[in-house]
């Protein structure tokens, strides 16, 4: 009886269970009553990452420098090339097909998480007791200066964008 289902790493064609081609190889000829499946290695700059019956290998991804991309990991016959972004840029999607500049956190906001090649800067508002007076992709919110530890008093209250201003203690009682 011809099979209706095949084992793992096989496929059914013309009532025959044929071996799939291993990762890194493409199908040249299906198996027959007389022959095993014929497979050939993928060429330079090509890959197949699964057991397959593909007659063409996939092209490695091109990391286009004009889009701010560079190679993070070179592709093999079994894996695609992995792109990442140049310093100061991050991917616009999981597939990393293009890059955008890391965003800066405005005054009043600090960096919660520094950007990577694949994720943008995450900003957070400076809470009470902290401030940021610059637009930056690296600076966290800084704590207000503690006037007391310098034996000074607060002359001007701090905000989320400015530090406190300390001054000498008023000696007149």
């Amino acid at each position: 009886e011809p099979p209706t289902a095949c084992r793992e790493k096989q496929y059914l064609i013309n009532s025959q269970c044929c071996s799939l081609c291993q990762p890194g190889q493409k199908l040249v000829s299906d198996c027959t009553e007389f022959t095993e499946t014929e497979c050939l290695p993928c060429g330079e700059s090509e890959f197949l990452d699964t057991w397959n019956r593909e007659t063409h290998c996939h092209q490695h991804k091109y990391c286009d420098p004009n889009l701010g991309l560079r190679v993070q990991q070179k592709g093999t016959s079994e894996t695609d090339t992995i792109c990442t972004c140049e310093e100061g840029w991050h991917c616009t999607s999981e597939a990393c097909e293009s890059c955008v500049l890391h965003r800066s956190c405005s005054p009043g906001f600090g960096v919660k998480q520094i950007a990577t090649g694949v994720s943008d800067t995450i900003c957070e508002p400076c809470p009470v007791g902290f401030f940021s007076n610059v637009s930056s992709a690296f600076e966290k919110c800084h704590p207000w200066t503690s006037c007391e530890t310098k034996d000074l008093v607060v002359q001007q209250a701090g905000t989320n964008k400015t530090d406190v201003v300390c001054g000498p203690q008023d000696r007149l009682r």
Epitope: S29, T32, E33, F34, T35, E38
Partner: antibody
């Protein structure tokens, strides 16, 4: 239905060349190898080699490799075998055959090599 | 090359009686994929070969069930349970496990 139709009988002189054809119909030509088999008068069968019409890849019996050339013309679903530097021992019936989902043979081409 | 040896060379048979043909290979025909690529076919006088059995024991579509194949490794047999007049011809075994593919010398089946 699948059919393999071979070219007509040939008579050649020793040292000459001959090109036999095998026209396929009734299936997708590039999906299956075409093989060639020799049967000398009153003799058994000898496998010459095969060609994959998808990419032109060939495999051969070493005995025939230096004198047999296998080609295809996918636009007319035809396979060819050219045999060069003919000698009297090449006198035989030559079959083309295809397998995969059944086995199919051409009707054979008779080649006579005689001075 | 793998040598395929068939016996007998000639097999006179009586209609309705069984017949058996042996085929031995000079090396094992078990492929690394687990299949054994040993095949049988018939050639009637003046005709192209006609395949009967593939991979030792699988009948091609349309082949009568009086034909059966068996064996493993290097030793194989084709049996005809009850010979009919149309079974006259030469029977060949062949192997496609090893390149070059090779054929047995043939067994001529004739009616007594």
């Amino acid at each position: 239905q699948v059919q393999l139709v071979q070219s007509g009988a040939e008579v050649k002189k020793p040292g000459a060349s001959v090109k036999l054809s095998c026209k396929a119909s009734g299936y997708t030509f590039i999906s299956y190898y075409i093989y060639w088999v020799k049967q000398a008068p009153g003799q058994g069968l000898e496998w010459i080699g095969g060609i994959n019409p998808r990419n032109g890849g060939t495999n051969f019996n070493e005995k025939f490799k230096s004198r047999a050339t296998l080609t295809v013309d996918t636009s007319i679903s035809t396979a060819y075998m050219e045999l060069s530097r003919l000698r009297s021992e090449d006198t035989a019936v030559y079959y083309c055959t295809r397998h995969g989902n059944g086995v199919y043979w051409g009707q054979g081409t008779t080649l006579t090599v005689s001075s | 090359d793998v040598v395929m040896t068939q016996s007998p060379l000639s097999l006179p048979v009586t209609l309705g009686q069984p017949a058996s043909i042996s085929c031995r290979s000079s090396q094992s025909l078990l492929h690394s994929n687990g299949n054994t690529y040993l095949h049988w076919y018939q050639q009637r006088p003046g005709q192209s070969p006609n395949h009967l059995i593939y991979q030792v024991s699988n009948r091609f579509s349309g082949v009568p069930d009086r034909f059966s194949g068996s064996g493993s490794g290097t030793d194989f047999t084709l049996k005809i349970s009850r010979v009919e007049a149309e079974d006259v011809g030469v029977y060949f075994c062949s192997q496609t496990t090893h390149v070059p593919w090779t054929f047995g010398g043939g067994t001529k089946v004739e009616i007594k």
